[in-house]
Interface confidence: low
Amino acid sequence: MMTGTIETTGNISAEKGGSIILQCHLSSTTAQVTQVNWEQQDQLLAICNADLGWHISPSFKDRVAPGPGLGLTLQSLTVNDAGEYFCIYHTYPDGTYTGRIFLEVLESSVAEHGARFQIP
């Protein structure tokens, strides 16, 4: 039985040109995390494998940085970065847990939501 839950940063906002941290946390389970995938719609952004470490998809490597922790840092944000992001936790023996984050990219400096996850 899958008892775990994913906590995420939820709906967050950031300014165009800025950076943001996408963060998920798996709790309430003793399952072993073997891999975490970060995906945007149908695109794979990054993989953090428990054994092999971080790998950023080559098409994103200039703007995506691993961490902190199992999170993902997006840099030089553009309006095209707005939308849904998914953290997919592969665990043994539970299986897969998925968390969803919605990112809004603002033209102006009114990104008040989720400010504690934003990088100055």
């Epitope: 073997t34 695109q43 993989i47 428990a50 092999l52 470490g53 998809s57 080559p58 098409s59 299986g95």
Partner: antibody, heavy 120, light 108 residues
Framework: QVQLVQSGAEVKKPGASVKVSCKAS????????ISWVRQAPGQGLEWMGW????????NYAQKLQGRVTMTTDTSTSTAYMELRSLRSDDTAVYYC?????????????WGQGTLVTVSS | AIQLTQSPSSLSASVGDRVTITCRAS??????LNWYQQKPGKAPKLLIY???SLQSGVPSRFSGSGSGTDFTLTISSLQPEDFATYYC??????????FGQGTRLEIK
Amino acid sequence: QVQLVQSGAEVKKPGASVKVSCKASGYTFTSYGISWVRQAPGQGLEWMGWISAYNGNTNYAQKLQGRVTMTTDTSTSTAYMELRSLRSDDTAVYYCARAGWEQQLGFDYWGQGTLVTVSS
Amino acid sequence: AIQLTQSPSSLSASVGDRVTITCRASQSISSYLNWYQQKPGKAPKLLIYAASSLQSGVPSRFSGSGSGTDFTLTISSLQPEDFATYYCQQSYSTLAITFGQGTRLEIK
């Protein structure tokens, strides 16, 4: 274009070691992993393990642990697979393959294969 | 390790036929399932990744579907160059990647 070029065929005696090379070109070597897959005559594909060209971390198939070592030389974009204590059932074609992160670890490019024959 | 079972092990078909090969995983692997084609004496070639995504350069007559434990590779209209052996591979358990046993597609 992406190419993986492997070393030539080898004939070895039981108990000996073999080291197969795989020279990559046409892409950023450190942005991908290299897997090794073997195929005994008339048989299916068997995954042997892989190495991250990014950080050198390895993961080996359980049945080969202790006998196989995978390494990379980033200065020459070359991956190596060494198999020790060879037995007759190690006779196979050995392939290196690039692990495509965007392909969710599908092996998107393969070497031409290296036939290793173990015979007394 | 996660086991992959392909069916059938072999099949005969004619040019123009629609062919379906299935791959069943011993546990749920989400969409971490890839399909390969291998011709005699040649290295395998990636056809489908992530269960349903067509690899660049692969003809559109190849398609993949499925999620969880049951997956399908379909060739909509067989061409002479499609006669080969097909393998599924899971990359869900990246610490123990496994292949199916293969399906040999022969000319009827």
